[in-house]
């Protein structure tokens, strides 16, 4: 296992060094057998090693921990609790395992954890207290600043209650974990791409006041009617590309207009260019909020296909066309 380094030149702070009563620098830390460690880079990589659990003997200097491509199915409470604690761990990548369950308090005792990536795990059970660590109504703030949850949706046959109800349950599960105990009030980046979301639960974003970057790319969002962005006063980037959005209503447009710094990315959605689109088209022509607005084109009705939204006049937008059944709102 490669560069597990000796540390002839490492020393602790002067006070700690004197307190240790030692004239020698501390010995090099051991490296878990399935991992590659570099103390100089403060990085431990345990990648594609078929690990079933988090290694017990992680070196305390670790700041970057890559545990990707293994075979862990459950992350229990205190999975990273160590003595002494992994106080310097800042970035934890658990993507591409087989995690189905993340228990309450799985990331407790990581006081410096700023970035967590759980992408590409089929999470059927993400505890509401996975990030909060306790079931208090207002828990201690999590140190997390960036949370990467791309493609954490389980396969259809693993979702509860079949397809549609299972998706609703999945979205609710994720929303509960994001809002519990107000723990993620310091979160600045949230990635939720490729999760088959059909809608955004009303309270998904309610407890994330510091959010600056939100990625909802490549979902199946049909409407944003029930979502509220009003509290996201620091939001700078909102990615909604590659969804199933048909139209944006005035309530959503007004909320975005009220966010001082936001840029919204809307490319590659199946916009329905009928009479309900008039307000959105008028808004697009005026706004600076949508950098890719010149690329937005109609998908329906057939006679409007590939027309640029910015090229449309109110006289182009009528409601006499019949939409495909799959696009009709129930």
């Amino acid at each position: 296992s490669a560069p597990s380094s000796s540390v002839p030149s490492s020393s602790t702070s002067p006070a700690a060094f004197l307190a240790s009563g030692s004239a020698q620098p501390p010995p090099a830390e051991r490296c878990p057998a399935a991992c590659e460690c570099s103390e100089a880079a403060r990085t431990v990589k345990c990648v594609n090693r078929n690990l079933l659990e988090v290694p017990a003997d992680l070196p305390p200097y670790v700041r970057n921990l890559f545990l990707t491509g293994n075979q862990m199915t459950v992350l229990p409470a205190g999975a990273f609790a160590r003595q002494p604690p992994l106080a310097d761990l800042e970035a934890l990548n658990l993507s591409g395992n087989h995690l189905k369950e993340v228990c309450a308090g799985a990331f407790e005792h990581l006081p410096g954890l700023r970035r967590l990536d759980l992408s590409h795990n089929p999470l059927t059970n993400l505890s509401a207290f996975a990030f909060a660590g306790s079931n208090a109504s207002v828990s201690a703030p999590s140190p997390l600043e960036e949370l990467i949850l791309n493609h954490i949706v389980p396969p259809e046959d693993q979702r509860q209650n079949g397809s549609f109800e299972g998706m609703v349950a999945f979205e609710g599960m994720v929303a509960a974990a994001l809002r519990s105990g107000l723990a993620l009030r310091g979160l600045t980046r949230l990635e939720l791409a490729s999760n088959h979301f059909l809608f955004l639960p009303r309270d998904l974003l309610a407890q994330l006041p510091s959010l600056r970057y939100l990625d909802l790319r490549n979902n199946s969002l049909v409407s944003l009617t029930y979502a509220s962005f009003r509290n996201l006063t620091h939001l700078e980037s909102l990615h909604l590309e590659d969804n199933a959005l048909k139209v944006l209503h005035n309530s959503t447009l007004a909320e975005w207009h009220g966010l001082a710094h936001v840029k919204v990315f809307l490319d590659n959605n199946p916009w329905v260019c009928d009479c309900y689109m008039a307000d959105m088209v008028a808004w697009l022509k005026e706004t600076e909020v949508v950098p890719d607005k010149a690329r937005l084109t109609c998908a329906f009705p057939e006679k409007m296909r590939n027309r640029g939204l910015l090229d449309l006049n109110s006289s182009d937008l009528d409601c006499d066309a019949v939409l495909p059944q799959s696009l009709q709102t129930s």
Partner: antibody, heavy 122, light 107 residues
Framework: QVQLQESGPRLVKPSETLSLTCTVS????????WSWIRQPPGKGLEWIGE???????NYNPSLKSRVSISVETSKNHFSLNLSSVTAADTAVYYC????????????????WGQGTLVTVSS | EIVLTQSPATLSLSPGERATLSCRAS??????LAWYQQKPGQAPRLLIY???NRATGIPARFSGSGSGTDFTLTISSLEPEDFAVYYC?????????FGQGTKVEIK
């Protein structure tokens, strides 16, 4: 965007102590790691040492007996002291930070200060 | 300490040509290797990190490859502003060390 600026005497007498300060702007010194690197005229780069935001120092063994790096959080700067200097210590001294530009802890030197030439001469 | 040996010491090429710079480590550094560019009177600038990742704002003509002990920096088509000195640096073991540099000069 973090910016770094070195300051201190440009001329130091042999056997004295070279002292430089690096002021950090556009970011907090209480995150990332902070390094000193030097480059003798016409030569390559040599890492001197670093101090982490938690106060841990690491020094190049070739200089360890003479070097000390400290941080003053309240002033958002960190300092280098190199004792018992000789003409061989004449170099451009750079401060640099490692960490923080990407989400993952980043151990590469980016950005750097513009450097300050320190000449050791009587 | 890990010694990094860069070759060639000088590379004389014309704009538009392809530049291939080599860095060899005295022992494995895994992928903990970076490349920097330095122009006269300026501080070095990070180009490539973790052996093959381009730093923010670095043009696509710069690419890095390699792992273990042998690494390559490639500039696919030299622009006038690319003529400079290039250093590799490892961060696998203490202390971090730099290669002695390769100067890319106009032919």
């Amino acid at each position: 965007q973090v910016q770094l600026q070195e300051s201190g005497p440009r001329l130091v007498k042999p056997s004295e102590t070279l002292s430089l300060t690096c002021t950090v702007s556009g970011g907090s010194i209480s995150s990332n790691d902070w390094s000193w690197i030097r480059q003798p005229p016409g030569k390559g780069l040599e890492w001197i040492g670093e101090i982490s935001y938690s106060g841990i120092t690491n020094y190049n063994p070739s200089l360890k007996s003479r070097v000390s790096i400290s941080v003053e959080t309240s002033k958002n700067h960190f300092s280098l002291n190199l004792s018992s200097v000789t003409a061989a210590d004449t170099a451009v001294y750079y401060c640099a930070t490692a960490g923080g530009s990407s989400g993952w802890y980043d151990y590469w030197f980016d950005p750097w200060g513009q450097g300050t030439l320190v000449t050791v001469s009587s | 300490e890990i010694v990094l040996t860069q070759s060639p010491a000088t590379l004389s090429l014309s704009p538009g040509e392809r530049a291939t710079l080599s860095c060899r480590a005295s022992q494995s550094v895994s992928s903990y290797l970076a490349w920097y560019q330095q122009k006269p009177g300026q501080a070095p600038r990070l180009l490539i990190y973790d052996a093959s990742n381009r730093a923010t704002g670095i043009p696509a003509r710069f690419s890095g490859s390699g792992s273990g002990t042998d690494f390559t920096l490639t500039i696919s088509s030299l622009e006038p502003e690319d003529f400079a000195v290039y250093y590799c640096q490892q961060r696998s073991n203490w202390p971090p060390t730099f290669g002695q540099g390769t100067k890319v000069e106009i032919k």
